[in-house]
Structures are given as C-alpha cells and as structure tokens.
Interface confidence: low
C-alpha cells in the first residue's frame, strides 16, 4: 500500500524518498522562514483501517518568518522545475530546520514510488484541515523503515494561501 | 456531494489496452483534486494516479509510470485513465476518488468520496 502525495504546507516544501506505508518524511521550510517552535515538520504514511487507505499525517508545521533574514525579499511560491529537469532538492540552511529524519531504505525501488511528469507544474495548495480518511497521529518514538525508496525526487510545491482560483504570478490554473 | 461513477473496465489479454473513465457529478468538479486508486484481490487500496484540479499537474505510482496517462475533460465533468501494456498484475478493481474539501486544483490531500469501482481482469 503507498500514500498518494502529501498536502502541501504553507511556506515548506517536500522531497518524498518513499511513498511506503509507515515511511517518514520531513517538510522544509522555505528560504527567509524558519520552523516556529513546538511545531513539527514530520508526517508519516499511515493506514486508515476503517478505509484501507493510506496517507500522510497531518504535520503541525508552522513556518514562520525568519527574523535573522527580514533585510532579504522573501522567496517567491515554489514552482516545479519544468520540463526535462529532475528536482533535486536544494541544501539546506541551518536556520530553525530540525535534522533531517533518517530513512533506512531497502534495495526495492521504484515499485511503488511516485514520480511527476516532466513539464507538469503543481499547483499552489491549502492544506485540507479534517477530511473523512484523514486521521490525525502523534509523532511516534520509533521509526520504521522506508520499504521503498524512489529515485526519483519529487517536489511539492506549496504557496500562500489564496483564494480559490487567485494564484501568485507565475501560477496558472484557469478552468 | 459529489458523486463519482466509474466505467470502461473489462477484461483483457497482457500487453493490451484499456480507457477507463470517471463521470463525476457535483459542485466544483474542475476544483477538485482527482486520482485513481486500485485494489488487487485480498489487498489494500493503493494510490495509481492523481491529477489537480486544472489538469495540469499529474502524479503517478511507479509500478504504472510510462503506461498509464491520467487526464481530465473538466467540460463534461470526466477523469480518465489510459492504460497500455497491461499486465496480470494490474488486475485489480479500479476506483475513482475526489478531495471535495481542497477545493484549489491541489494534490488529493484526504479523499472523501469514492466511486464503487470498476474491475480490470488481465489475463496472460
């Protein structure tokens, strides 16, 4: 069983290594915010047993602006690498990132992995906040190895709230 | 509520192609986020492919990629999913799903309304 791809989270990003029922993941907050205290970037694929469907919990990330970075503009919405170029995720600035969440992973790849077409863009998003197979689970203290890991990057791209249909510049989504 | 309802299942040879197709009815259907969902016998329901809202953003699982093509016509209200090279072990039934709360063209964050599937049998 794998999860479908995550919710985006206002200000983060995430590079999913594997889709795989119990894998943990970590978003990151964009350049110019930092993680606000007591809040966690960590989201983990889970089984609704009532439904037998899978995905990803709800992080209670917040990301804040970083005060050490209000001199710089803030980064623009995060936008997918168009086509023919793989994401690949960008280093990582120290600011208020909590360590980077260990994925022990087998050899099987790529069985259950998710990929973006290239050329295909993401759309700015707001996370869904309670949903009929949406469960909510607290961070556990063991963390289960990833099934599967993919090799393939992929990039979701996150953006200011907005109203339906009112995008940042650069975004199109007519209908 | 939006009410999905699947069609286009059948039963084929491996190597051989099928269409599947989702009419949806309802509110806000070229807001939502859409995607396709399988169960094999005895097996959960696993995540095949997604779609946001407008159409351009597309996501598939693995095991599928290159052969299955998710797209959507948001005038007649209808996903479908284009399957080449089929093989055994894509028999499963195949289910439409919808995130009718996320109503910004974004990934399926959290389904809330299935179709009641469709069966796909490839034989060898």
């Known amino acids: 069983i794998t999860c479908p791809p995550p919710m985006s989270v206002e200000h983060a990003d995430i590079w999913v290594k594997s889709y795989s029922l119990y894998s943990r993941e970590r978003y990151i907050c964009n350049s110019g915010f930092k993680r606000k205290a007591g809040t966690s970037s960590l989201t983990e694929c889970v089984l609704n047993k009532a439904t037998n469907v899978a995905h990803w919990t709800t992080p209670s990330l917040k990301c804040i602006r970083d005060p050490a970075l209000v001199h710089q503009r803030p980064a623009p919405p995060s936008t997918v690498t168009t086509a023919g170029v793989t994401p690949q995720p960008e280093s990582l600035s120290p600011s208020g990132k909590e360590p980077a969440a260990s994925s022990p992973s087998s050899n099987n790849t790529a069985a259950t992995t998710a990929a973006i077409v290239p050329g295909s863009q993401l759309m700015p998003s707001k996370s869904p906040s309670t949903g009929t197979t949406e469960i909510s689970s607290h961070e556990s203290s063991h963390g289960t190895p990833s099934q599967t890991t993919a090799k393939n990057w992929e990039l979701t791209a996150s953006a200011s709230h907005q109203p339906p249909g009112v995008y940042p510049q650069g975004h199109s989504d007519t209908t | 509520e939006v009410q999905l309802v699947e069609s286009g299942g059948g039963l084929v040879q491996a190597g051989g192609s099928l269409r599947l197709a989702c009419a949806a009815s309802g509110r806000t259907f070229s807001k939502n986020p859409m995607g396709w969902f399988r169960q094999a016998p005895g097996k959960g329901r696993d995540f095949v492919a997604g779609?946001?809202?407008?159409?351009?953003?597309?996501v598939y699982t693995g095991s599928v990629k290159g052969r299955f093509t998710i797209s959507r016509d948001n005038a007649k209200n209808a996903m479908y999913l284009d399957m080449i090279s089929l093989k055994p072990e894509d028999t499963a039934v195949y289910y439409c799903?919808?995130?009718?709360?996320?109503?910004?063209?974004?990934?399926?964050?959290?389904?809330?309304?299935w179709g009641q599937g469709t069966q796909v049998t490839v034989s060898s």
């Open positions: 779609i946001s809202g407008s159409g351009f953003g597309k």
């Open positions: 799903a919808a995130d009718t709360r996320n109503r910004d063209g974004t990934w399926i964050g959290v389904v809330d309304s």
